[in-house]
């Protein structure tokens, strides 16, 4: 058993049929010694008396808010949550496996630049009685500070018969050094509590590996005289690290119709302009990627050909 | 050329060669990017490699003030990785595919380090740790980790030379 926060405790249980469970001793936070009784949740049934209560925690029915009273007055609470371990593996029932970039990916994180600011998100089908708390650091043995905000519900989607909820959190490294080569990864830890179930999820990454620039901005077309070609130009996204002579991007320019199966023109360039062939009913799209490190491509920025 | 006395390097040549190094480092093992090597206990491996750190003057302001500190750090790293790529980690079993770009990578590391430091001038170099994995699978894992780390190192070096070529070239 360990303390998650004040008056909230997590009991770690090996979860299998007829498991013996864990013996837990609760102590009432009071100077009083006599006349103390214990109840669980809203029940008025007295579970025991005395300053301490010893219980055998085996299942979710044994978890909950234990309260010690004296003469009708509440003295203190202890909330017990369960953390299940099945076949040596901690349960991951609360969050959905996003399976990208690999199986057992529950947390996904992205950064728009090298400033040390990043966003992580996760998915669940649970809509109520759900709380998250996020902590982060650079490195684990001698951790350096990363400050995370509160996790918020950022999107709701319907997937078949189910509703899916996306939560996200923004974090900022306290003393970021954008130009340095990272040697210690960022660690992100998410505590998830659904009713009386506790789970924790972790992710470890270098900012350089989660970089995904915003799409290029201000796409403009200039038709070339006596030619089917147009010159397309764009600018670096505002959110990208500066100066651009140091933090350089490379670009992919593509002309394609509405369907992915349609024919296309495609060219890669380090410049902020390119010459392509525009077709009626097609769009010109441009996306960006760090020039020197193969992290994710940005989403496409598009303008119609006409 | 970046001579220990303090003259400027051939920024444009360094830019071209460092960008080539980036391409090579990713083609040497593109799939490295999809392996989560941090799960494998990095301590003895990549803690010993020279990283370009915050105080090394490789940021745009530091380069403007005095590029020598940064260039020396880059030079140290190039020599270090060049030695690693020539060590039995890469030459031993399992043999690298003959078409692996590791050979070109090795030669290009040497080429860039020579551009930065002509013969006859000597900067301090870092000792290469004695990493002698006994099992072929350990050697394979070590290669992946070294290449992954090299990808990060050459990315920073390429940024330095691109910025230098754009803003510090005579």
């Amino acid at each position: 058993i360990w303390e998650l926060k004040k008056d909230v405790y997590v009991v770690e249980l090996d979860w299998y049929p007829d498991a013996p469970g864990e013996m837990v001793v609760l102590t009432c936070d009071t100077p009083e010694e006599d006349g103390i009784t214990w109840t669980l949740d809203q029940s008025s049934e007295v579970l025991g008396s005395g300053k301490t209560l010893t219980i055998q925690v085996k299942e979710f029915g044994d978890a909950g808010q234990y309260t010690c009273h004296k003469g009708g007055e509440v003295l203190s609470h202890s909330l017990l949550l369960l953390h299940k371990k099945e076949d040596g593996i901690w349960s991951t029932d609360i969050l959905k496996d996003q399976k990208e970039p690999k199986n057992k990916t529950f947390l996904r994180c992205e950064a728009k630049n090298y400033s040390g600011r990043f966003t992580c998100w996760w998915l669940t089908t649970i809509s109520t009685d759900l709380t998250f708390s996020v902590k982060s650091s650079r490195g684990s043995s001698d951790p350096q500070g990363v400050t995370c905000g509160a996790a918020t519900l950022s999107a709701e989607r319907v997937r078949g018969d189910n509703k899916e909820y996306e939560y996200s959190v923004e974090c900022q490294e306290d003393s970021a050094c954008p130009a340095a080569e990272e040697s210690l990864p960022i660690e992100v830890m998410v505590d998830a509590v659904h009713k009386l179930k506790y789970e924790n999820y972790t992710s470890s990454f270098f900012i350089r590996d989660i970089i995904k620039p915003d799409p290029p901005k201000n796409l403009q077309l200039k038709p070339l005289k006596n030619s089917r070609q147009v010159e397309v130009s764009w600018e670096y996204p505002d959110t990208w690290s500066t100066p651009h002579s140091y933090f350089s991007l490379t670009f992919c320019v593509q002309v394609q119709g509405k369907s992915k199966r349609e024919k296309k023109d495609r060219v890669f360039t380090d410049k902020t302009s390119a010459t392509v062939i525009c077709r009626k009913n097609a769009s010109i799209s441009v996306r960006a990627q760090d020039r020197y490190y193969s992290s994710s491509w940005s989403e496409w920025a598009s303008v119609p050909c006409s | 050329r970046a001579v220990p006395g303090g003259s400027s390097p051939a920024w444009t040549q360094c830019q071209q060669l460092s960008q080539k190094l980036c391409t090579l480092a990713w083609s040497a093992h593109p799939l490295v990017g999809h392996m989560d090597l941090r799960e494998e206990g990095d301590e003895e491996t990549t803690n010993d490699v020279p990283h370009i750190q915050c105080g090394d003057g490789c940021d745009p302001q530091g380069l403007r003030d005095n590029s020598q500190f940064c260039l020396q750090r880059i030079h140290q790293g190039l020599i270090f990785y060049e030695k690693l790529l020539g060590s039995d980690i890469f030459t031993g079993e399992p043999s690298l595919l003959p078409d692996s770009p590791v050979g070109q990578l090795h030669a290009s590391l040497l080429g860039l380090s020579q551009l930065l430091q002509p013969e006859g001038h000597h900067w301090e170099t870092q000792q290469i740790p004695s990493l002698s994995p006994s099992q072929p699978w350990q050697r394979l894992l070590l290669r992946f980790k070294i290449l992954r780390s090299l990808q990060a190192f050459v990315a920073v070096a390429a940024r330095v030379f691109a910025h230098g070529a754009a803003t510090l070239s005579p």
């Epitope: 089917r228 296309k264 495609r266 360039t269 010459t275 009626k280 | -």
Partner: antibody
Framework: EVQLVQSGAEVKKPGATVKISCKAS????????LHWVRQAPEKGLEWMGW????????EYAPKFQGRVTITADTSTDTGYLELSSLRSEDTAVYYC???????????WGQGTLVTVSS | DIQMTQSPSSVSASVGDRVTITCRAS??????LHWYQQKPGKAPKLLIK???QSISGVPSRFSGYGSGTDFSLTINSLQPEDFARYYC?????????FGGGTKVEIK
């Protein structure tokens, strides 16, 4: 199977015009760009131009501008290359090539030898 | 026009050898470079697109690398059917241009 079948060899006199054809099968003709590339005996490859059969848009290499016409007939799934004012250095194997991507060549015809000789 | 220079113009090798052909562009072309194989009397065949992207059905012994102005095609463990001429082609800008070709012949 995507296939391009070209017309047979031609012998032409200098100053004449040649028109060769390229019949597509195994795909929707207007879904691919069609290019023409030539290769002089024992020489390298030389790109001449392309057509978008969907709308008739064309682009020619400056070297051939004014002498070359590329057309496409969607009713017969056939592309054509017409080269006028022939000279001896136009003696070459002419290939049609197609792709959904404009700038490289995925599928090739078998080639048509055009000999220009007086 | 962008000039493409291939080297060597010919190379003699034996079955099982590793052969590397290089291609240099007269200006930076990013990764807009493709490789073709041509056997005598036949049309060219696409081997690699955009410098290093493999083509389905092409044996994995063919690999490409490069960016900017310098590119290479490597044939690892040369097979009897690989003796042919190889061409690079840039697609950075029109007109599309090819290298002069490299002939891989039997030693």
């Amino acid at each position: 199977e995507v296939q391009l079948v070209q017309s047979g060899a031609e012998v032409k006199k200098p100053g004449a015009t040649v028109k060769i054809s390229c019949k597509a099968s195994g795909y929707t003709f207007s879904d691919y760009y069609l290019h023409w590339v030539r290769q002089a005996p024992e020489k390298g490859l030389e790109w001449m131009g392309w057509i978008d059969p969907e709308n008739g848009d064309t682009e020619y290499a400056p070297k051939f501008q004014g002498r070359v016409t590329i057309t496409a007939d969607t009713s017969t799934d056939t592309g054509y290359l017409e080269l006028s004012s022939l000279r001896s250095e136009d003696t070459a194997v002419y290939y049609c090539a197609a792709n959904k991507e404009l700038r490289y060549f995925d599928v090739w015809g078998q080639g048509t030898l055009v000999t220009v000789s007086s | 026009d962008i000039q493409m220079t291939q080297s060597p113009s010919s190379v003699s090798a034996s079955v099982g050898d590793r052969v590397t052909i290089t291609c240099r562009a007269s200006q930076s072309i990013s990764i807009n470079l493709h490789w073709y194989q041509q056997k005598p009397g036949k049309a060219p065949k696409l081997l690699i697109k955009f410098a290093s992207q493999s083509i389905s059905g092409v044996p994995s012994r063919f690999s490409g690398y490069g960016s900017g102005t310098d590119f290479s095609l490597t044939i690892n463990s040369l097979q009897p059917e690989d003796f042919a001429r190889y061409y690079c082609q840039q697609s950075n800008s029109f007109p599309l241009t090819f290298g002069g070709g490299t002939k891989v012949e039997i030693k």
